[in-house]
Interface confidence: low
Amino acid sequence: EPPTACREKQYLINSQCCSLCQPGQKLVSDCTEFTETECLPCSESEFLDTWNRETRCHQHKYCDPNLGLQVQQKGTSETDTICTCEEGLHCTSESCESCVPHRSCLPGFGVKQIATGVSDTICEPCPVGFFSNVSSAFEKCRPWTSCETKDLVVQQAGTNKTDVVCGPQDRQR
């Protein structure tokens, strides 16, 4: 009696169970009563990442330099190429199909986390006692100058965008 279901890594065709092709290989011809499934390795620029009965391998992803992409990991016969973004850029999506420039943190904000090839800059507001007067993708909030340690007094209070201004103490005559 012909099978209605097949074991793992097999498929049902013409009332018989044939072996699937292993990752990195494509199907050339189904098995017969007398012959095993015929498989062929994917070419250098192609891959298949599962046990399969595909007659065509998939093309490796192209990391398009026009879109700021570069190869992070070269594809094999069993894995796709992994793209990442060039320095100063990060992916716009999880699949990294294009890149955009890293965000800069505006004055009043500092860098909480520096951008990577896959994630954008994370900014945070400078808390009281700290400031940032630049637009930067790298600089953290800096602490206000301590006038006291320089034997000076605060002449102008600091803000989240400006440092305090120190000056000499008024001496009584």
């Epitope: 250098e44 093309q59 192209y62 330099p65 700021g68 850029l89 890149c99 420039p101």
Partner: antibody
Framework: QVQLVESGGGVVQPGRSLRLSCAAS????????MHWVRQAPGKGLEWVAV????????YYANSVKGRFTISRDNSKNTLYLQINSLRAEDTAVYYC?????????????WGQGILVTVSS | DIVMTQSPLSLPVTPGEPASISCRSS???????????LDWYLQKPGQSPQLLIY???NRASGVPDRFSGSGSGTDFTLKISRVEAEDVGVYYC?????????FGPGTKVDIK
């Protein structure tokens, strides 16, 4: 049909600046990578710059890096080339060209070109 | 940068006869997806360049079938099976694999 029309050329003194424009029509401008290519009188083609669909990525020939800036305004279907500190060797016909994308990589449609002459 | 060279730089041709232009790149323009990132352009006298062949061997839309491109890696050839008078001009190869993109110096084709 695809049309690319360059403008903004002319005679300019060395050291001055110039902005070339390229008005695009007949295709969805915001979906295409765009190039600038130039050709000095009697010479061959020289690739100058390229810009991605949304303007986030741009690349330049080493000979123009730092002086040339490619930009685009997708709302106006226009590509630009800002040329600063002009030199005699910048004298050329400047072409803007559309890139065919992944299916047809490289410039597939070209404008008629605009002449820039750098002379005192 | 990838340097492109062409030969010959000048090619006098006879109408009806075949013609062949060679283009060589200083490094391979064959990408791992199996495609050669090389284009051929023709610039007719007084005109803008026009795309003839893309990805090494594919004829662009509207290009007559007497034009064909072949080759892989670093060595490429543009063939015209039977030259016509309208084919005169300068032929350029261009690599579009990596920036900066680069053109060959051009081959000037004219009628003998």
């Amino acid at each position: 049909q695809v049309q690319l029309v360059e403008s903004g050329g002319g005679v300019v003194q060395p050291g001055r600046s110039l902005r070339l424009s390229c008005a695009a029509s007949g295709f969805t401008f915001s979906s295409y990578v765009m190039h600038w290519v130039r050709q000095a009188p009697g010479k061959g083609l020289e690739w100058v710059a390229v810009m991605s669909y949304d303007g986030s990525s741009k690349y330049y020939a080493n000979s123009v890096k730092g002086r040339f800036t490619i930009s685009r305004d997708n709302s106006k279907n226009t590509l630009y080339l800002q040329i600063n500190s002009l030199r005699a060797e910048d004298t050329a016909v400047y072409y803007c060209a559309r890139d065919g994308g992944k299916a047809v990589p490289g410039p597939d449609y070209w404008g008629q070109g605009i002449l820039v002459t750098v002379s005192s | 940068d990838i340097v492109m060279t062409q030969s010959p730089l000048s090619l006098p041709v006879t109408p009806g006869e075949p013609a062949s232009i060679s283009c060589r790149s200083s490094q391979s323009v064959l990408y791992s997806n199996g495609y050669n990132y090389l284009d051929w352009y023709l610039q007719k006298p007084g005109q803008s360049p026009q795309l003839l062949i893309y990805l090494g061997s594919n004829r662009a839309s509207g290009v007559p079938d007497r034009f064909s491109g072949s080759g892989s890696g670093t060595d490429f050839t543009l063939k015209i099976s039977r030259v016509e008078a309208e084919d005169v001009g300068v032929y350029y190869c261009m690599q579009v694999l990596q920036t900066p993109f680069t053109f060959g110096p051009g081959t000037k084709v004219d009628i003998k």
